[in-house]
Structures are given as structure tokens and as C-alpha cells.
Amino acid sequence: IWELKKDVYVVELDWYPDAPGEMVVLTCDTPEEDGITWTLDQSSEVLGSGKTLTIQVKEFGDAGQYTCHKGGEVLSHSLLLLHKKEDGIWSTDILKDQKEPKNKTFLRCEAKNYSGRFTCWWLTTISTDLTFSVKSSRGSSDPQGVTCGAATLSAERVRGDNKEYEYSVECQEDSACPAAEESLPIEVMVDAVHKLKYENYTSSFFIRDIIKPDPPKNLQLKPLKNSRQVEVSWEYPDTWSTPHSYFSLTFCVQVQGKSKREKKDRVFTDKTSATVICRKNASISVRAQDRYYSSSWSEWASVPCS
Amino acid sequence: RAVPGGSSPAWTQCQQLSQKLCTLAWSAHPLVGHMDLREEGDEETTNDVPHIQCGDGCDPQGLRDNSQFCLQRIHQGLIFYEKLLGSDIFTGEPSLLPDSPVGQLHASLLGLSQLLQPEGHHWETQQIPSLSPSQPWQRLLLRFKILRSLQAFVAVAARVFAHGAATLSP
């Protein structure tokens, strides 16, 4: 058993049929010594008396809010949550496996630049009695500070018969050094509590590996005289790190016909313009990627050819 | 060329070669041997490799103030990785795949280090740790980790040279 926060405790249980469970001793936070009784949740049934209560925790029915009283007055509470371990593996029932970029990916994180600011998100089908708390640091043995806000519900989607809820959190490294080569990864830890079930999820990454620039902005076409060619131009997204002579992007320009089956013409360039042939009913799209480190491409910015 | 004591490097040449190094480091990564990338292990990359850190003056302001500190750090790293690529880790069994551009990567590391420090000039170089894994699978794992950290190292070096070519070239 360990303390998650004041008066909230997590009991770690090996979860299998007829498991013996864990013996837990609760102590009433009071100077009183006599006349103390214990109850669980809303029940008035007295579970025991005395300053301490010993219980055998085997299942969710044994978890909940234990309260010690004296003469009708509440002295203190202890909330017991269960953390299940099945076949040596901690349960992951609360969050959905996003399976990207690999199986068992519950947390996904992205950064728009090298400022040390990043966003993580996760999915669940649970709509009520759900709380999250997020902590983060750079490195684990001698951790350096990363400040995370509160997790918020950021999207709701209908997937077949189910509703899916997306939660996200923003974090900022306290003393970020955008130009340095990271040697210690960022660690993100999410505590999830659903009713009386506790689970924790972690992710470890370098900012450089989660970079995904915003799409190029101000995408414009300029027809070239007496030609089917057009000059496409664009700008770096506002959110990208500066100066651009140091934090450079590379771009992929694509001409795509209306039908997905039509041949795509693609050009790679480090410049912020390119000359392409504009076919009728086609569209021109541009996306960006860090020029020197192959993290994610941005989403496409597009304009029609017409 | 970056000569100890201080004249400027051939920023544009360094920019071109460092950008080439970035491509080579990425293209070499899947081709250092048959291995499922998921087996790579999530623990930190070999801690002995040199990193370009916050105080090394490789940020835009530091380069403007005095690029020599940063260039020396980059030079040390290039020599370090060049020696690793020539070591038993990469030359031993299991053999690199035939398609692997590690030879080009090796030559380019040496080429860039020579651009930064011509013959006859000497900066201190970092000791190469004796990383000699006994098992072939350990060697394979180490190759992946070395190439992963090399990708990060050359990305910073390429930014330095791109910025230098754009703002510090005579």
C-alpha cells in the first residue's frame, strides 16, 4: 500500500481467482484513543472499533472510503483504491490502446517546436467518475522540472456504438534549451482513477522525436506566363522555432488530382517556393518536416489549382 | 576552416556535408542488421557518447559570440563517432547489410571533421570508451543506439552550420 495523495491510498493486488489479497492496517488520524468506530462508504454498519482497523483487501467491495468516528463526529477518512496486477502485468482498463506508433501506446505526445512545450493526449470510453493527474520530468534519476497543467476533456467522438473521449494536457519544460542535443528523455506519468480503480500510464520520449510542425501558412499560387506551370509559395508556420536559419524546415509539394487513383507528383525542397504543373481539377498541397531530423511531417496545407 | 585559435570554417561546405550526414544517419539506421526495432529497448542511449549541451555555445547567440567553443565540441563528436564506426561494433559480426550506407556515413564523418580541423592543427579529442560487446545481438543493439544518438548529434551540427552559412559567412 502507498499514499497517492493525502488520505488516498493505493493497494496493489495480484488479481487471480481466490487470491489471498493484502492485509491493510488503517490508522485513525486523531489524538483520541477510545470510543472510535469505523464504517465504509455510506454504510452505517460498524466494521470495527479502536484507533486502528485491520482489513483483508481482496476485491473492489473491500475498497472505498473508510471513516473513523467518535460519538457521531467524523475524525478522519482514508480512501482505498485498487491497482490490479494480472499475470505480472498492471491493468490498463481505463485507457484505450491507440496502437500508434506501436501496440500498447496509451499516451501520445506531440510538440510543434523545440521550445520545451508539448501536448499529450489519451482516449477512453469511460464518461463518468474519472480523474487524471499528470506529472512530468526530464530524466528520472536526477529529474529536472517539467510543469503540466490539468488534464481536460478535449474531444468526444462516436465510434460505432461507443462514445470515445479524448483528454489532453499541456506541459512545459521549466528550463528548456531548444538548441541543445537532448541526452535525457522527458518522462510523462499519468495517474488515472475510475471509481475505485487506480492505474498509471507512462511515456518516455525526446522532444526531437515528437516534433510535428504546424502546416505551412499563406500557401499561394502564381501562374507563370504562357505555361501550365505555377509558382507555389508558402511561409514557415508561426509556431515553428526561430531563427529559421537555425531551425530549418524541408517541404514536400504534391499535386493531386480529384481521384485518389491519379498519379501524384511530388517534389521535395528546402525553399519556400516551387514550380509545378497545375492540372485541371487538381489541388496543390505542401507539408513541412524538420530539415535535419526525421520526425513527423506536418498536416498538408492545400489550395485548388483552378 | 575552423582552426584552433579562431579563423572561420568553410561554413557552406560544412553545411552541405552536415546535411548529407543527416540523410546518411537516417538511411543507415534500419540497415545495420536484421533486428526488430521494438527490441531496441527504451533505456537511454549509450551514456558515453558526447552530446552538444546547453553550455556548449551551439545556439544562435553563442555562435554569434564565439563559434569556436561549439565547433570544437562538434569536432570532438565527429571524431568520436568516426572511431565508433570503424570499431568492432560495426565491423564485427553480424555483418552490416550489403545495402547499408555506413561506409558513406563513416567517410562523411571523417570529411567533416577534416573540414573543421585541417592537418597539423589539434584540438583535444575525447577518449573513445571501450565499448566491446561480446554477443552479436548486443553489438546489433549498440549499433542501433549509436546511430540513434548520431542522428540527434548531426541534426544539431547541421543547424549550426546552416545558421553559420546564413549569418556568419564572410
Epitope: V267, S294 | S27, L31, T91, P98, D99, G103
Partner: antibody
Framework: QVQLVQSGAEVKKPGASVKVSCKAS????????MTWVRQAPGQGLEWMGQ????????DYNEKFEGRVTMTTDTSTSTAYMELRSLRSDDTAVYYC?????????WGQGTLVTVSS | DIQMTQSPSSLSASVGDRVTITCRTS??????LAWYQQKPGKAPKLLIY???TLAEGVPSRFSGSGSGTDFTLTISSLQPEDFATYYC?????????FGQGTKVEIK
């Protein structure tokens, strides 16, 4: 299995251009360099250049610089080599080969004849 | 550019003979050397890479050795199908260059 299939033979006049294609299958196209090598009749092998499809980054033999362009179409896993301002001594078999080191996989070759 | 000097330019040998072809480079290329076999009208076939590693499907009578600037291809017991032209190629930095070839003919 890995296969590289090249376009058919071409006959060109001096000063013209030729574009040879090489369609790859059996592997992840963007992960490997594609190299072009040529061989004049009765002569040895000559490295022309290479391209990395994931980024479009290309390197050329200085001998061909300015006359050769290598491109790829990642949507069809096809590499292209265009040689311009053809001369009679460009008559050769042009090969694509996979990789940026030793070449384990080669196309069948495309004979380009330059003759007036 | 790295120069490749292959010798001999041609040799005559009989089935069962031990054949040795050498390749010398103008500068240190570590072990970044490949050997190819080419038959008329066909694309080259990779035999050895990284100086000594046998390519997939290549008979064990072929072997490679050397590092730095001096390399050797050995055919321990020449077979009828081995009569062909052999090329060395370095893959240490661009431009890659090939040796001028060694034609192995029937004595």
C-alpha cells in the same frame, strides 16, 4: 522477393534526353538508397549517382553533374534517371541497383543507344 | 576520388584451380569493399560485401579478405559456371568507384 524492373531499350539522337525508369517491389521503397550504374559496350562499371527516396536527396558523379537528374515517385515505388545532352559515348547499358553500399539487387538493365 | 587497381586484368585457369584476384585502393577504405561477378548480357551479381561477408546464395568456394587498401577475392576451386568477369567496388564515401575488371577465362 525484391525486384527491380527497368524500362525498355531506347535509341536517341545526340543532344536529346533519355529518362529511364526502375520500378521496385518486394521491399519498403523509401528505406533504401537507389543507385544508378552504367556500362558502355565492352567496358567496366561506372557509378552515376544515388537518390534517397524518403527525402529526395541525391548525389551525382561529378562527371555527369548538370546533365543527370535522379528522381523518385514514392507513390508508385519508381526511380527515374534522366540524362540530357546525350553524346555518342553515352551509349551504354544503364542499371538501377538498390542500396548505398554494396548492391545485392540490380535491375535487368536498359540499353540506351545514342546515334545520329 | 578513390582509385581502384584490380589485377590481373585477365587470367586463364582450369576447373578445380584456386584463383586469386586482388584489388588495391588509393586510400584507406577500411572494410568497405564489395566483389561482383558479371556474365555477358547480365547484370552484375554481388558475391562479397564488407570485404569478407559472403552474399546470400553465393557458394562458399568464394571468399574475400583484406582491409585498408589491399583486398583479395579467392575462388578455392574454380567451377565451370565461374568463368566470368569480376569487379571490385569500394563503398566508402562517394563517388563509388569500380575496379576495371578481371576476366577469368578457360585455359
Amino acid at each position: 522477393q525484391v525486384q527491380l524492373v527497368q524500362s525498355g531499350a531506347e535509341v536517341k539522337k545526340p543532344g536529346a534526353s533519355v529518362k529511364v525508369s526502375c520500378k521496385a517491389s518486394g521491399y519498403i521503397f523509401i528505406t533504401y538508397w537507389m543507385t544508378w550504374v552504367r556500362q558502355a559496350p565492352g567496358q567496366g562499371l561506372e557509378w552515376m549517382g544515388q537518390i534517397f527516396p524518403a527525402s529526395g536527396s541525391a548525389d551525382y558523379n561529378e562527371k555527369f553533374e548538370g546533365r543527370v537528374t535522379m528522381t523518385t515517385d514514392t507513390s508508385t515505388s519508381t526511380a527515374y534517371m534522366e540524362l540530357r545532352s546525350l553524346r555518342s559515348d553515352d551509349t551504354a547499358v544503364y542499371y538501377c541497383a538498390r542500396g548505398g553500399g554494396g548492391f545485392a539487387y540490380w535491375g535487368q538493365g536498359t540499353l540506351v543507344t545514342v546515334s545520329s | 576520388d578513390i582509385q581502384m587497381t584490380q589485377s590481373p586484368s585477365s587470367l586463364s585457369a582450369s576447373v578445380g584451380d584456386r584463383v586469386t584476384i586482388t584489388c588495391r585502393t588509393s586510400e584507406n577504405i577500411y572494410s568497405y569493399l564489395a566483389w561482383y561477378q558479371q556474365k555477358p548480357g547480365k547484370a552484375p551479381k554481388l558475391l562479397i560485401y564488407n570485404a569478407k561477408t559472403l552474399a546470400e546464395g553465393v557458394p562458399s568456394r568464394f571468399s574475400g579478405s583484406g582491409s585498408g587498401t589491399d583486398f583479395t577475392l579467392t575462388i578455392s576451386s574454380l567451377q565451370p559456371e565461374d568463368f566470368a568477369t569480376y569487379y571490385c567496388q569500394h563503398h566508402y564515401g562517394i563517388p563509388f568507384t569500380f575496379g576495371q575488371g578481371t576476366k577469368v577465362e578457360i585455359k
